[in-house]
């Protein structure tokens, strides 16, 4: 899910009767993005 969007979450925006997640930030907090952004501290030994 890599894309150039920045890594921000301004909280939830409220609309009448519903809550909107800020700008669909799931991609920035996805497993795929975590793999791109950080090394696993203790990778499993082979």
């Amino acid at each position: 899910l890599a894309d150039p969007l920045d890594h921000r979450d301004a909280g939830d925006l409220w609309f009448p009767g519903e809550s909107e997640s800020f700008e669909d930030a799931h991609v920035e907090h996805s497993i795929s993005r975590s793999l791109l952004e950080g090394e696993i501290p203790f990778p499993p030994t082979s």
Epitope: S21, S30, E37
Partner: antibody, heavy 114, light 112 residues
Framework: EVQLVETGGSLVQPGGSLKLTCATS????????LHWIRRSPEKQLEWVAQ??????????YYAESVKGRFIVSRDDSKTTIYLQMNNLKEEDTAIYYC?????WGQGVMVTVSS | DVVLTQAPLSVSVTPGESASISCRSS???????????LYWYLQKPGMSPHLLIY???NLASGIPDRFSGSGSETDFTLKISEVEPEDVGVYYC?????????FGAGTKLELK
């Protein structure tokens, strides 16, 4: 290799409780938002709950159908999330998946029946 | 809740031919940043769902470019340009913008 492994599913009577566990590995866990999503016997997918990261104060969100009955939590030290299900109803019968929306676990069956 | 209406509910396709699945949202899924929060999944028989398309038109990792997503703010289409036997299963659209997050009812793709 990314893995999400759900356990804890079983047959339970209406009104009973169950705790599902999703053990993850293969990716940096702490900043990832994770969800529980279920597939009913009618093959409809339904989002159940979400838990955000520590940087988001572990914010949680629930479907109206489970609010007040289900609790999602996470243990960053164990790279695991949980779904505590109380006061179970027959309509909670489903395969429950742990997912980051991009990767999914294999699912675990929960059957609520008397 | 945001209602996602898929059509058709089932489709039968000859291998090598193209197939299109429609998904209509009851509200706009376009954010102020120009992101459209519409996702497509395929659930193959006996398997977990897996991601095909994210944010309306972005191909997920490892997905062949026979799959493509397009649409507007409320009307979306998944196209499979040349259907292969491995494409059989149930296709779901989903939105992850408005709580509660919702899925379409699914479109079952079968081979002729």
């Amino acid at each position: 290799e990314v893995q999400l492994v759900e356990t804890g599913g079983s047959l339970v009577q209406p009104g009973g409780s169950l705790k599902l566990t999703c053990a993850t590995s293969g990716f940096p866990f702490s900043n990832v938002w994770l969800h529980w999503i279920r597939r009913s016997p009618e093959k409809q997918l339904e989002w159940v709950a979400q838990i955000k990261a520590r940087s988001d104060n572990y914010a949680t969100y629930y479907a109206e159908s489970v609010k007040g009955r289900f609790i999602v939590s996470r243990d960053d030290s164990k790279t695991t999330i949980y779904l505590q299900m109380n006061n179970l109803k027959e309509e909670d019968t489903a395969i429950y998946y742990c997912t980051g929306l991009d990767y999914w676990g294999q699912g675990v069956m929960v059957t609520v029946s008397s | 809740d945001v209602v996602l209406t898929q059509a058709p509910l089932s489709v039968s396709v000859t291998p090598g031919e193209s197939a299109s699945i429609s998904c209509r949202s009851s509200r706009s899924l376009l954010t102020s940043k120009g992101i459209t929060s519409l996702y497509w999944y395929l659930q193959k028989p006996g398997m977990s769902p897996h991601l095909l398309i994210y944010r309306m038109s972005n191909l997920a990792s490892g997905i062949p470019d026979r799959f493509s997503g397009s649409g507007s703010e409320t009307d979306f289409t998944l196209k499979i340009s040349e259907v292969e036997p491995e494409d059989v299963g149930v296709y779901y659209c989903a939105q992850f913008l408005v709580y509660p997050y919702t899925f379409g009812a699914g479109t079952k793709l079968e081979l002729k």
